[in-house]
């Protein structure tokens, strides 16, 4: 009897949908695996007789519940199927946006770039998929614990009237208000402000 794959799960970030599993202990030799997806009531092969423990399902439609399954094989024997269901638009993890930060005197000027999507045109981003897409920004003075959060209305934001000659750190994430779903934070970007631009009268 061939044991089934273990710890079968979908790892999906920005619609890069990778079905992953672990190979069970099997004394007779090396196992191979076949992964399939349900399409119009028929299971179709996606990865056949692979020695890998993952299979790329990024070409699935973003909408709807998909049934995926994987089994282990050895010679003419095979394990039972292990099934999972997956709805990309609901289940994919929203990866961190890109961010450009520029210091202008005592201000930080930020521009946000929505995450790109696997198997899509360069310009079709997560912002196109989710109508309610917005950004959360948090910033703090480097070396302090107090963080401030803002929700920009656009793809850019300016933090004004900051303390001069002070290092501020900023990070951004995508947020979907209608789903109350937050994405992953970007890596912090830390920049030092320069002088206060106000001119004494």
């Amino acid at each position: 009897m061939v044991p089934p794959p273990e710890n079968v799960r979908m790892n999906s970030v920005n619609f890069k949908n990778i079905l992953q599993w672990e190979s069970p202990a099997f004394a007779k030799g090396n196992l191979t695996f076949t992964a399939q997806y349900l399409s119009y009531r028929i299971f179709q092969d996606k990865c056949m007789n692979t020695t890998l423990t993952e299979c790329d399902f990024s070409s699935l439609s973003k909408y709807g519940d998909h049934t995926l399954r994987v089994r282990a094989e050895f010679a003419d024997e095979h394990s039972d199927w292990v099934n999972i269901t997956f709805c990309p638009v609901d289940d994919t993890i929203i990866g961190p946006p890109g961010m450009q930060v520029e210091v202008l005197a005592d201000s930080l000027h930020m521009r946000f770039l929505a995450p790109k999507i696997e198997n899509e045109y360069e310009t079709w981003t997560m912002k196109n998929v989710y109508n309610s897409w917005t950004y959360n920004v948090q910033y703090w003075k480097n070396g302090t614990d107090e963080k401030f959060q803002i929700t920009p209305q656009y793809d850019f934001e300016v933090l004004r009237n900051l303390e001069p000659w002070t290092t501020y750190c900023v990070q951004v994430r995508g947020f979907l208000p209608d789903r109350n779903k937050a994405g992953e934070w970007s890596e912090p970007v830390c920049e030092q402000t320069t002088h206060d631009e106000t001119v004494p009268s």
Epitope: Y63, T123, N128, N131
Partner: nanobody, 124 residues
């Protein structure tokens, strides 16, 4: 059942232009995303361009960027693909597709309704 009808294909010399049209028979083309795809002889389906209704944003495959322009005329319920500077490698059957949910642009899996296609041949 939505019926998409493409027209405007034909034979054109390299460097020439064509304008493809996509209309919905008896229906409005009121879908979040309309896309154009193509299939060259012996090859798979390839995304060419799409237009999003909500933002009227347009998106293109690298191979056609700067040469093709997608547009929509809501009053005529028609989406157009203006193809300029045509090359031999643009020879294919061109399909129009409509998406109910508008979540994707390039992947055929994200489209629900398809036309029958129109042949474009670029040859001297």
């Amino acid at each position: 059942e939505v019926q998409l009808v493409e027209s405007g294909g034909g034979l054109v010399q390299p460097g020439g232009s064509l304008r493809l049209s996509c209309a919905a028979s008896g229906n409005s083309l009121d879908y979040p995303t309309i896309g154009w795809f193509r299939q060259a002889p012996g090859k798979g389906l390839e995304g060419v361009s799409c237009i999003s209704a909500s933002e009227a944003s347009t998106h293109y495959a690298d191979a056609v960027k700067g040469r093709f322009t997608i547009s929509r005329d809501n009053s005529k319920n028609t989406v157009y693909l203006q193809m300029n500077s045509l090359r031999a490698e643009d020879t294919a059957v061109y399909y129009c597709a409509a998406s109910l949910w508008g979540l994707g642009c390039k992947s055929e899996a994200d489209y629900d309704y398809w036309g029958q296609g129109t042949q474009v041949t670029v040859s001297s």
